[in-house]
């Protein structure tokens, strides 16, 4: 699989994807904020 995330539980895999999505959204917001502040 693409980024080295490995788990034997499908629900755990889905949770990892949800966390990744959340972090991407948070980091994306921070990045946009930094650009705006510049």
């Amino acid at each position: 699989h693409s980024d080295g995330i490995f788990t034997d539980s499908y629900s755990r895999y889905r949770k990892q994807m949800a966390v990744k999505k959340y972090l991407a959204a948070v980091l994306g917001k921070r990045y946009k904020q930094r650009v705006k502040n510049k």
Partner: antibody, heavy 117, light 112 residues
Amino acid sequence: EVQLVQSGAEVKKPGSSVKVSCKASGGTFSDSYMHWVRQAPGQGLEWMGLIYPIFADQRYAQKFQGRVTITADESTSTAYMELSSLRSEDTAVYYCAIDQDASFAYWGQGTLVTVSS
Amino acid sequence: DIVMTQSPDSLAVSLGERATINCKSSQSLLDSDGKTYLNWLQQKPGQPPKRLIYLVSTRESGVPDRFSGSGSGTDFTLTISSLQAEDVAVYYCWQGTWFDLTFGGGTKVEIK
């Protein structure tokens, strides 16, 4: 209501590859877990793998590791399953399916792939 | 991989009678999140499978209440309380708890 429409039947030679498409409508494609399942004639169902389009993250069944590639094009809400080094045992109907509650709630109509010399 | 064993392979039942299909997994399907991802599919000839029951006992919307699912851990049952002509199909159990996701071999339900 989610709808999955798959590409048409294919006839392939042993050793070649096949690429089947699955176009989704009526849902959030990027945030769906798209699976591929196959069914040989008169046989049961076999899970091949999945993709989570938002991150293009794939998981493949051990049996197909190295021979299957699942991709997704978010711009067209289409998933693809490519199977290489085809042999006669790969003759099957290939289905895409979208997960809800770790259960396949929506299925494509199926694509028959025939491998014959 | 988790092995899903269905029994019987085929079943002939009179209209209005009860049909019972068993499904056994080689390992518990209870996940760490407290849910059990055991599902049942119905497949009619020439059609894709259709979700019937998920999370052991939750009926898909539109599925008649004569269909019910039960069980826990490794042992599960699909019951059709009063068989109708339109229930003739192959039924599959499958598990979505562990990778690789795996299916039972199917049970063909016919009318006696």
